[in-house]
Every structure is written in C-alpha cells, then in structure tokens.
C-alpha cells in the first residue's frame, strides 16, 4: 500500500531458472521407405536451450525436415504457389513465404502439381500442421525452479525469493504454498486460465510475474514476493501475424563430403519472468 | 504530456520477434587447391539464432576457419608477432591477441616469415578483413515482425502493439503506416540515418525504441506505441575497443576419430528492442 | 545527490560484452581401456556462447557423458535409487531425479549394485562431483570489455561508458582506473569479496552493477558510470535448491546411422550486467 512519506525505489533484479523433467515421445519414423513407430526420450538438454536472463524456453512440439542439401528443387505447393508454365516463375525472385530463390522454371512437384523451381535447402520444408496432440505434451508435468535475487541500491538492501527455511521438495500452490518457488508448468497454465495441452501444439508465451512490494522500515519490515501468471501471446491472433511461438534451427553435418542439415521447426512455451515492484523507506 | 494529478506507473513489457527473408551468398570456395565461385542460400535457421527476450541478431557477414584441429602450429603473423629466434617466444605465454599458448619455439609460418609456435586450434585463424561488400548484404530486405505485450499491473491494464484490425502484409512507415509492426531492416537503418550496406560489413547494434505514453483515464483514453530507431554502437570507436558487432562460434565434428571444428566469426546486426513509457490514471 | 527541483528520468540502456582469453585444460582421457593425460586449448568459441543482452556466460568447469545413445540401461545408483527386485521398479515411472523412464525391471548396474532399468540416453549420466580444481580455473585471467550505451529519452540525452580519450589497453581498478571498462574476471570477484577458484568449481552468478547518476543541467553537468560488483547466487544454498550455476547441453551426431550425443554439464559464471540510475534536469 502507498505510504506517501516513504522514499520509493524500483527493484534491480536477477533471475536464474532450472527446468526438470523427461518426456517420452512417440512418432512415425520413415527409414528406407518403411514407416514404423519410434519412441524417444527427451531430457533438458534436448528440449531446452542454454538461455540467460529472464526467459526460458521449453520445446513442446516440432516438425523436422531431415537431410536437406543446397541445390535446385520445386518449391512447396502452398496456396497460390502452383504454376503451369515458366511465365509464372520469375528468375531471381524471393517470395517472402518461399524458402528459396526462383530460377524461372516451372517444374513438377509431384504427379499432379507443378511449382516454381528454387535454389534452396532441398527438399524444401513441407508446410504441414504442427502435430496434434503435441509430441512433448507431457511437458505439462515438468517443473521449474526460479531463483530471484533483488536489490534496492539506494536503500542498500538485498534479498532473494528462496529462504534458508524453505523445503526443496515443495511445489507452488496459490493457497497452500504461495512462497514455494518450484512451479509445475501445468499449474502455471491453470492459474492463468489456459489449457496447456492446447497451447503446446502451436506454442505460446507465458508470463510469470514476481511482484515485490517492500516496506523496508525496521518497525514494519516486509519484503516477500507475490507470484502471478498471465499469457502474453495473443491466442486470437490472425494467421498473418504468426500465432503461437516457434522458431527454426538447424543441425549441420557432412555426408560423403556434402554439407547437409536437419531443419527443426520448434514449437514451445517461452516463459518470461517479469520482476517488478518497489522498496519504500522513511 | 505530464498530467500532474495522475498516478504514473512504469510499463512491464514482453517482446517476441520473427525475422523473414532469404539471402543468396556468392563467395570464393577453395577445394583441393582449386578456387571457384560458390553460391549458397541462407534462410532464418542459417543467419539468426534462437534468442529470447528483447534482442535478435541477423548475421550479415562472416569469416570461416575450416577444419581446425588441436595441435601445434605457428601463430598468425599479425603486426608485432613475428620472431627470428626462440628467444622471442616464451613457453607458456598467452598473448591476449593470440589464439594459443606458446611452446617457446620460433618456427616458419611461410616462406618469408617466422612466428612463435603455439598449442591451439590449428591452423590458427587468419586475421583477415571482413569481406567487403558484406556477404549477406541483401539482409537489408529482410523484415522483422515485432510483437509487444505491455502491462501496467497497478492499473490492471494490459494491451499489445498488434490490434485485430491490423493487416499482416503491411510494412512500417513513419508517415503512411506508423502503427504497422513489420519493419524492413533497411528502413530501420534509413530512419536512424545509417547506411545498412556499410554497417553490414563489420556489424553493429541498432536500437528499436518502443515508447508507450498511456493515458488510462476513461474520458481521454490513449495507449498506442511510438517507434523510433537509433544506432547503439559507436561507429567512431577506436580499433582497440572492438568496433562493430561480431562473435565467434564453432561447429564441432569428428573425422577419422579426430575432433575438429569449423570456427565462424559472425558479423551482424544485433537489434535491441527498448520498451519504455508510463501509464497514468487519475 | 537528490535535487528535488529536477525532473528525474530512469535510464534506458543497451549493453555489449566481449570476452578475451585462452585456457589450457588438462584432464584424464580414457580410450580403449588406457587412461592418459589429455591437454586441450579452449578459446572464446569453446567456453562462451553467443548471448544477447545483459548477460554473458564463461564456462569454468564441465562433466562430459560421451557417446550416449537412446536405449535401455540401468539408471545411475544415486542415494535411494537401488533395487533388489522388480517390485521396486514401476513401469512408466519418471523419477524427477532420474534421467529416464522405468521399464519395471531391476537389473545389475555393477557387480554389487542393482538399479531400475530405464529407457534413456545411455549410459545415463554419472552423478559425479564437478572436478576440483575447476578445469578452466585459469579463466580468472580472462578479461571482458563492457560497452554500455545509455539514453534518457525525455531529456533527449545519449552517452556511453567508453569515451574517445580512453585507452584500449587499460584494466579496471577501483582506485587507479575506475572509468576503464575492461575488467579482469578475477578482479571482479576480488572486488565482490569472493574467491574465483572456489566459485569456478560449481559455478555462480556475479552481478556487475553500472550506476549512472546524471545531472544534465548545463551549469553542473555530470554523467559518468560507477561500477560495483556483488555475487547474486546464494553460496549457502541447500543442495535441494541446486547451488552454483550449471546447465546441460548436447552435441548430436550420427555414427553408423545411429543418432548419438555427447552431453556436457557446463558449470560456469553467469555475469549479469545491471544498469540503473536516473537523469535529472531542471
């Protein structure tokens, strides 16, 4: 609450996160023309990335384009991309939606469709839907430990969200354990009124707000965090503005002296930890 | 404008960026002693990195040191690094400019020059100029979509820069479309009074400032962002303070059971999105 | 000092860091049953990661699990994980401490111990202590150049910590050179009253605070940074809250068409650069 006689100062904050959990992923794997069910295990090194600062990312879904090589090939026949003659294809043209640079030739993509030939990583990425349900949907049961160190330099006061008295096997609960800083990802979504299973398909951004309202006067000292959660991406966003949260990254390798890559389109939840508040002192 | 009767609160912000574009790169490639022109395509997975938060990076230029292996070799003969006898080389010495640890021997680098032998990733990186013009100079035509969600917790008010009425095929223009949040990289530089082609060679840091001056009183409500752009690195910086923006990263691989790496010195533009402003309410 | 007649404005900041240094690492390497001493050189591309924003990370220690492959194997026999019969192992169970999903079988881990079989990256990571002394303990002698550009948009004032008059071969010293922005990592720790050699083993988080107290009135203009240092992680933290600073990442590769990875548990220092302060003008 506002104490007008106090000198207020904004918080200086540092955050450290640690995600725990394992996911079992079952997907169709095609090898030598034969498709069979493949089971694999994803641990933290597989589904999260070494990130600094106030964000962490958990991959919940993906689409792989394996064995791409730099060459010429027909582009993917998405809506409006098909052609019937070379006239439709413009040498040197880069369609922002496309994945390559047109050569000017119209070539067969498959038995029934023709598209403009491109210089690109081939075969070009298929623009297929993200798998539903999400491949790492069990990430709902992962947990994240959040460590937050705060400082009010003007008041020369430092504290942190984890106290020596805390129990490392706790799980945050708004009522029963509101000071525990280990959060189940599914609970964060539930608190924010969101459905993890649904968001995991396309990805999204979730805010974890840590609010410090600190009274630093010795006679009524209080300085503990309050956690709240809200979704930061727009779930009603128009297709053209790229709904959800995803990014592409590549694993490069050489095969018979040819540079190749596996392209991964990773969908997931980016968690932004937003720390704010003030320290007041007479 | 300042309304002294209002309670002002700083903005809490979350940013999500999405870069689009393809670059065609032409460079000299040497294979088995023969040098020929190589053409390659770079897409987002090749020139940008999965980054969180308020920054994104676009690689505009690079220098590669391929097939490095850990062994002994002569260091690169940069200014002041040449030697004529072992006396000039100090066993165990690590010159901050060098890339290895001296063995104490002075050995031939080429027909005319001798340098101190080092234990390092060999052959050591040649300290050659960044290619001019920049290899990915066409990145000027890439676009970035910036999504910004803001929150004034004290006023319990949330909004975002992208409204449902917006058109996903717009491009930001200071006069004609100042609310569009899709920016052409070249336009950002032009607005900041900078030359993209020039900065692309050595790299640099560009600030995209998003200013929210929000009046949250119902009778005169206004809360939309204002975008401005300014260069953040010092273009007049002394050589010793590392002008431009670059970093080195490595791709590791095994060949005949020997650990090797390709070292990439990546030059590029780091874009920092700086969100600030206040929300005022009676 | 507070000038009550001034209009104060918080600082908008952008940071760019550049780490320099080489480490020689000596460790035991086992190949074909023979253990010998291996020497290797780590340069910036090996021990740091391309990071944006107000953080940089320097790896000071590591534990490698080489050649892991997805299969079935006994889990690591940490405290409380051993079994004597299949009854102790629950098919489908994922222990948060474990690295895989139990199959329901109790199998020999070694001659004396049995553990639950898991589907995991095998062999599972041994939960061994971080090497002591730290493998890259010589990182104490690395240096970091910090470039900080600040802006007070309301006062339309911009400046940076590096001035044209500065000398690029300086090293920060609290008394002799308090404006130099090249810092020796060991000095940062000494200033913060911490022991680099000790922290390097388990890792930690170190804050570099840059305080700008700017008087922008023309008649008494002053706007230079003041640097201070403090440790941000809790060195007295309970084991259950994961003391120090580490993360796991993987290098993936294919061998005989089998997907493999080397898992690296990287310990190190994350440096958070915390910029704060105000600009005041009549």
């Amino acid at each position: 609450s506002d104490k007008l006689y106090q000198r207020k100062e904004p918080v200086i904050s540092s955050v450290h996160t640690k995600v725990k959990g394992i996911a079992e992923v079952t997907e169709n794997v095609t090898e030598g023309g034969v498709t069979k069910l493949g089971h694999s295990i994803f641990d933290t090194a597989d589904y999260t990335f070494p990130l600094q600062g106030n964000s962490f990312f958990v991959m919940t879904n993906y689409v792989k384009s394996e064995g791409q090589v730099q060459t010429l090939c027909p582009e993917y026949p998405r809506r409006g991309a098909q052609c019937s003659s070379d006239r439709r294809c413009k040498k040197g043209w880069m369609d922002p939606q496309s994945k390559g640079i047109q050569t000017g030739r119209c070539v067969p993509y498959d038995k029934t469709r023709k598209t403009c030939e491109v210089s690109a990583w081939c075969p070009t990425e298929e623009e297929k839907e993200a798998p539903r349900p999400a491949l790492l949907r069990s990430a709902e049961n992962f947990t994240v430990l959040i460590k937050n160190n705060i400082h009010f330099p003007g008041h020369n006061y430092t504290t942190r969200n984890i106290l020596p008295t805390m129990n490392g096997s706790c799980t945050f609960h708004k009522t029963w354990d509101p000071q525990c800083s280990i959060f189940r990802l599914g609970d964060i979504f539930q608190e924010a009124g969101e459905n993890f299973t649904e968001v995991a398909v396309q990805g999204g951004i979730m805010g974890i707000e840590i609010y410090w309202d600190c009274n630093l006067d010795s006679w009524s000292h209080h300085c503990r965090p309050r956690y709240s959660f809200r979704r930061l991406d727009d779930k009603n966003m128009d297709e053209s503005f790229v709904p959800g949260y995803n990014f592409r990254y590549a694993k490069y390798y050489k095969e018979n002296n040819v540079e190749k890559r596996t392209l991964i389109k990773a969908f997931g939840i980016r968690f932004d930890i937003l720390v704010f508040g003030t320290g007041g002192k007479f | 404008s300042d309304k002294l009767y209002q309670r002002k609160e700083p903005v809490i912000s979350s940013v999500h960026t999405k870069v689009k574009g393809i670059a065609e790169v032409t460079e000299n490639v040497t294979e088995g002693g023969v040098t020929k022109l190589g053409h390659s395509i770079f897409d987002t997975a090749d020139y940008t990195f999965p980054l969180q938060g308020n920054s994104f990076f676009v690689m505009t230029n690079y220098v590669k040191s391929e097939g490095q292996v850990q062994t002994l070799c002569p260091e690169y003969p940069r200014r002041g690094a040449q030697c004529s006898s072992d006396r000039r080389c100090k066993k165990g010495w690590m010159d901050p400019q060098s890339k290895g640890i001296q063995t104490g021997r002075c050995v031939p680098y080429d027909k005319t020059r001798k340098t101190c032998e080092v234990s390092a990733w060999c052959p050591t990186e040649e300290e050659k100029e960044a290619p001019r013009p920049a290899l990915l100079r066409s990145a000027e035509n890439f676009t970035v979509l910036i999504k910004n969600n803001i929150h004034f917790p004290g006023h319990n008010y949330t909004t975002r820069n992208i409204l449902p009425t917006m058109n996903g095929s717009c491009t930001f223009h200071k006069t004609w479309d100042p609310q569009c949040s899709i920016f052409r990289l070249g336009d950002i530089f032009q607005e900041a009074g900078e030359n993209f082609t020039e900065v692309a060679v050595q790299g640099g840091i560009m600030g995209i400032e998003i200013y929210w001056d929000c009046n949250l009183d119902s009778w005169s409500h206004h809360c939309r962002p204002r975008y401005s752009f300014r260069r953040l690195d010092d273009k007049n910086m002394d050589e010793s303070f590392v002008p431009g923006y670059n970093f080195r990263y490595a791709k590791y691989y095994k060949e005949n059971n020997v650990e090797k790496r390709t070292l990439i010195k990546a030059f590029g533009i780091r874009f920092d999105i700086l969100v600030f402003g206040t929300g005022g309410k009676f | 000092s507070d000038k009550l007649y001034q209009r104060k404005e918080p600082v908008i900041s952008s940071v760019h860091t550049k780490v320099k240094g080489i480490a020689e690492v000596t460790e035991n390497v086992t190949e074909g049953g023979v253990t010998k001493l291996g020497h290797s050189i780590f340069d910036t591309a090996d021990y740091t990661f391309p990071l944006q924003g107000n953080s940089f990370f320097v790896m000071t220690n590591y534990v490698k699990s080489e050649g892991q492959v997805q299969t079935l194997c006994p889990e690591y026999p940490r405290r409380g994980a051993q079994c004597s019969s299949d009854r102790r192992c629950k098919k489908g169970w994922m222990d948060p401490q474990s690295k895989g999903i139990q199959t329901g079988r109790c199998v020999p881990y070694d001659k004396t111990r049995k553990t639950c079989e898991v589907s995991a990256w095998c062999p599972t990571e041994e939960e061994k202590e971080a090497p002591r002394p730290a493998l890259l303990r010589s990182a104490e002698n690395f240096t970091v150049l910090i470039k900080n550009n600040i802006h007070f948009p309301g006062h339309n004032y911009t400046t940076r910590n590096i001035l044209p008059t500065m000398n690029g071969s300086c090293t920060f010293h609290k008394t002799w050179d308090p404006q130099c922005s090249i810092f020796r990592l060991g000095d940062i720790f000494q200033e913060a009253g911490e022991n680099f050699t000790e922290v390097a083993v388990q890792g930690g988080i170190m804050g570099i605070e840059i305080y700008w107290d700017c008087n922008l009135d023309s008649w008494s203009h002053h706007c230079r940074p003041r640097y201070s240092f403090r440790r941000l992680d809790d060195k007295n933290m309970d084991e259950s809250f994961v003391p120090g600073y580490n993360f796991r990442y993987a290098k993936y590769y294919k061998e005989n068409n089998v997907e493999k990875r080397t898992l690296i548990k990287a310990f190190g220092i994350r440096f958070d650069i915390l910029v704060f302060g105000t600009g005041g003008k009549f």
Epitope: - | N257 | T30, E31, G32, G33, V34, E66, G67, Q68, V69, T71, L72, C73, V107, P108, K111, E117, C122, P123, E255, N256, K260
Partner: nanobody, 127 residues
Framework: EVQLVESGGGLVQAGGSLRLSCAAS????????MGWFRQAPGKLREFVAS????????RYIDSVEGRFTISRDNTKNTLYLQMNNLKAEDTAVYYC????????????????????YGQGTQVTVSS
C-alpha cells in the same frame, strides 16, 4: 594377460546351426562386455554381436539379427554365439574379443574398443 580361445566352428550346410564358444583365462572377464567379430577372405574384420558385462543387453549387426544369439556364463568365464539358419555369406573366421571401453552402449560395434582377440575359429557354410 588374458587368453581367449574360440571353438565350435566347422563346415555346415546352408540353413544349419553351429554354437561357438570362447573360453577366457588369465583374468576374470565378467567385468567386461564381450563380442564376436568375423573376417571373410579379402574383407575387413566386421562386428557381429556383443553382450554387456552382466549379460542383460545384447547387440547384433542387422544381417544376423534374429538368427544369431550371443550369451555368456560368467561363472565359467565363457562367451557363446548360437548361429541358426546359416547362410553362405556367414562364411568367415570368427573371433571373440573383450570390450575395453569406454561406453559399451555407444561403442560396442567399434573394433578399436576391444582388446585381446583370440586366434579365431573357421565357419564355412556350403550352399
């Protein structure tokens, strides 16, 4: 020093079976993974099958999967290879070896990870 002695080879018709044995002496091999390799005339030595130290996990080359079974008896310091439904392309000298490491799960098929090969036993499959 470890000695490995293979036995059980011979001439057999296509479709027939053989059981190879490998007796170890000089050191207990129960702490080590063990494997079978083979070398056909004019070809490189190739991995056939391997078993980890405890006998719980086994690995095979694709061409013998389902036909060959590797097993061990640690009490007798002996390794076995049961070969069924033999084919002409299985003709080779078969060697046993023990795994020196590191990391059996990843390197079970790499000849350089094994040491102390035996003298070998000839298997000939006539069609």
């Amino acid at each position: 020093e470890v000695q490995l002695v293979e036995s059980g080879g011979g001439l057999v018709q296509a479709g027939g079976s053989l059981r190879l044995s490998c007796a170890a002496s000089g050191r207990t091999v129960s702490d080590y993974g063990m494997g079978w390799f083979r070398q056909a005339p004019g070809k490189l030595r190739e991995f056939v099958a391997s078993i980890n130290w405890s006998g719980i996990y086994t690995r095979y080359i694709d061409s013998v999967e389902g036909r060959f079974t590797i097993s061990r008896d640690n009490t007798k310091n002996t390794l076995y290879l049961q070969m069924n439904n033999l084919k002409a392309e299985d003709t080779a000298v078969y060697y046993c070896a023990y795994f020196l490491g590191p990391n059996w799960y990843s390197n079970y098929g790499r000849p350089s990870s094994y040491g102390f090969y035996g003298q070998g036993t000839q298997v000939t499959v006539s069609s």
